[in-house]
């Protein structure tokens, strides 16, 4: 919520150090609550760096004040079950952007460490931590990724319809009737099959789907040269401007697209979101995650970060675990079980790597002689006579559509249906009115049409 000088702690300083504009980054590190491992320094439960980073503009002589922090969440994905007890480490890093006092620099301003006890699914917990002359106000919570539920996120929820104590719109889980499915945090109406969210009220689309609620299939076509399919009958369109167009990375940095934004891989000696920061030395503490800084005694000589296991990047800023290669397809969640990896698939997908699309004809056959028909990015079964339902597993009720006209009674039969017609009507569907004078039967007029309307009998 805010970061700044604590009350009554000597001469108040500003996080920007009165050196002009600066940015604050927050690195969150989760460790096991009780760790017997020698790898005490590793963030074994997970780590993340803040991404919503505004520039704070401040000038020498201004009175110091706490800086309001942006609302952007710092999401730390944790692997396996949530332990409940954990150590929370929050580092506050300053990136100085001004030209005063030697130019840009990175500094670790504060590092707060504390043991916490927290069940997943609970409300936000507020906290204030002081370290040295700094004070950090923040909130934190633990949340399970569906379909995991429970205080430890260790149970997988298969929702079922049944009377329960669950809140409105939430259903109990099979086989844990006392557990309720996790409430949806996505934008209302976001497609559960083709959309997902990482933050409340957003809706991100899986490959092949688009639209604000991910309900519009992206039409495929034979467009060549990486052109994208255009609207019907317009051929192909050139892709719109991408985040890397014009290469926003300075100083020889290489740009890669990451979910609608971009990421710069900076050459040694440069840092910042666009590799715009230079002249960094080891004294500025540029190596994250316990990386060892070597060289770089002065701004002209490049430093090198030697990263601890599990981290890479020119500043050890990227966590590299065995899930980094993204083995799970179609938005599946990768879990490292120690001896191997496993994928937790999103709804509508199955297989060890979530590679089978259950909404795809290749994924599952239609029963009882039904045929699978694909279209619009989904599949449906066209069922044989006498069968119905999504997979043609249900015996169809031939009388459900009330096929017998004029009050005729319908009887289901092994070969279809039989109509017992009301007096004065005849035909397979009781569609003919019987003339009392013995003349030929004529189709009975539907209600609202006169018997003699010519357009009815052309």
């Amino acid at each position: 919520h805010s970061f700044g000088p604590g009350p009554g702690l000597g001469t108040p300083r500003s996080p920007c150090n009165a050196r002009g504009p600066c940015r604050l980054f927050f690195r969150v590190c989760l460790k096991p609550g009780v760790s017997q491992e020698a790898t005490e320094s590793l963030c074994a439960l997970g780590a993340a760096l803040s991404t919503s980073v505004p520039v704070y503009t401040e000038h020498p002589g201004e009175s110091a004040a706490a800086l309001p922090l942006p609302d952007g969440l710092v999401r730390v994905p944790f692997r396996d079950a949530w332990p409940g007890t954990f150590s929370l480490v929050i580092e506050t890093w300053r990136e100085q952007l001004g030209e005063h006092a030697g130019g840009p620099a990175w500094n670790l301003l504060a590092r707060v460490v504390g043991r916490r006890r927290l069940a997943a699914g609970g409300p936000w917990a507020r906290d204030v931590q002081r370290t040295g002359t700094w004070e950090l106000h923040f909130s934190y919570r633990a949340r399970c990724e569906p379909p995991a539920v429970g205080a430890a996120c260790a149970r997988l929820c298969r929702s079922r319809s049944a009377p329960s104590r669950c809140g409105p719109g939430l259903r109990p889980c099979t086989p844990f009737p006392d557990e309720c499915e996790a409430p949806s945090v996505c934008r209302p109406g976001c497609s559960p099959e083709h959309g997902y969210c990482e933050e409340p009220d957003e809706c991100r689309c899986l490959e092949g789907w688009t639209g604000p609620l991910c309900t519009v299939p992206v039409s495929t076509s034979s467009c060549l040269n990486s052109r994208v399919p255009g609207p019907a009958s317009t051929g192909c369109l050139l892709p719109g401007p991408g985040p890397c167009d014009g290469n926003p990375c300075a100083n020889g940095g290489s740009c890669s697209e990451t979910s609608g934004s971009f990421e710069c891989a900076c050459p040694r000696g440069f840092y910042g979101l666009r590799c715009e920061v230079s002249g960094v030395t080891c004294a500025d503490g540029p190596c994250f995650n316990g990386g060892l800084c070597v060289g770089g005694e002065d701004p002209d000589s490049a430093y090198v970060c030697h990263c601890p296991p599990g981290f890479q990047g020119s500043n050890c800023e990227k966590r590299v675990d065995r899930c980094s290669l993204q083995p799970c397809q179609n938005g599946g969640l990768c879990l490292d079980l120690g001896h191997a990896l496993r994928c937790r698939c999103r709804a509508g997908f199955a297989g060890p790597r979530c590679e089978h699309d259950l909404d795809d004809c290749a994924g599952r056959a239609c029963a009882n002689g039904g045929t699978c028909v694909e279209g619009g990015g989904s599949r449906r079964c066209s069922c044989a006579l006498g069968f119905g339902g999504r997979d043609c597993r249900e015996r169809a009720d031939p009388c459900a559509s009330r096929p017998c006209a004029h009050g005729g009674r319908c009887y289901a039969h092994f070969s279809g249906l039989v109509c017992a017609c009301a007096p004065g009507y005849m035909g397979v569907r009781c569609e003919f009115a019987v003339r009392p004078d013995g003349a030929d039967a004529v189709p009975a007029a539907p209600r609202g049409l006169r018997q003699a309307d010519p357009q009815r009998f052309l």
């Epitope: 890479q312 980094s324 083995p327 001896h339 191997a340 990896l341 496993r342 590679e355």
Partner: antibody, heavy 120, light 107 residues
């Protein structure tokens, strides 16, 4: 039958580039990562990097960052290793080796190796 | 990076001998390691995965054991075709690393 067939030997001059291919058959290409391993003459094995053919995501040994690039062509079930600005010390046998993407197995099948000689 | 220290670097043995090669990791790797065999001029071949599981088609005289940071490859009765170089490899963490190798020679 699972097979990884690599391209033939290459003789290159320093500063040139080389692209080594590894064609996979007998299994679902996108279900297995492809590792690349280097063996200099008379030396042991050195892991260079790994690529997920499904997503194209790569991870490199920091020793092999910069001049070395891994890629795949899913349509032909082929993985590639490209080395640019060749140096004499790049002279080695380069192997591709598949690995189950859920890490249930180690590097079970290997290509026959491609000898790259860099000499002026 | 995880260091894999393999010993011995070479050994001489006779047909029928029991041979043991060890590999020590610089930190625990939870069984995420394998053993490879390489004959002169040939590509390596997988023998053992997950510390103790035999790859398909590998004779049962080969066995692997160990946990934590220490692992062993045993050849219960050495055969003429077993004279080769043997390597351990860890895949617990990137970058993967190999042991220095053990050359098994005829006595």
């Amino acid at each position: 039958e699972v097979q990884l067939v690599q391209s033939g030997s290459e003789l290159k001059k320093p500063g040139a580039s080389v692209k080594v291919s590894c064609k996979a058959s007998g299994y679902t290409f996108t279900d297995y990562y492809m590792n690349w391993v280097r063996q200099a003459p008379g030396q042991g094995l050195e892991w260079m990097g790994i690529i997920n053919p499904y997503s194209g995501v790569t991870i490199y040994n920091h020793k092999f960052k910069g001049r070395f690039a891994l890629s795949v062509d899913k349509s032909s079930n082929t993985a590639y290793l490209q080395i640019s600005s060749l140096k004499a010390e790049d002279t080695a046998v380069y192997y591709c080796a598949r690995q189950d993407s859920l890490l249930d197995y180690a590097m079970d099948y290997w290509g026959q190796g491609t000898t790259v000689t860099v000499s002026s | 990076d995880i260091q894999m220290t393999q010993s011995p670097s070479s050994l001489s043995a006779s047909v029928g001998d029991r041979v043991t090669i060890t590999c020590h990791a610089s930190q625990g790797i939870s069984g995420n390691m394998g053993w490879l065999q390489q004959k002169p001029g040939k590509a390596p071949k997988g023998l053992i995965y997950h510390g103790a599981n035999l790859e398909e088609g590998v004779p049962s005289r080969f066995s692997g054991s160990g946990s934590g940071a220490d692992y062993t490859l045993t050849i219960s009765s050495l055969q003429p075709e077993d004279f080769a170089d043997y390597y351990c490899v860890q895949y617990a963490q990137f970058p993967y690393t190999f042991g220095g190798g053990t050359k098994v020679e005829i006595k």
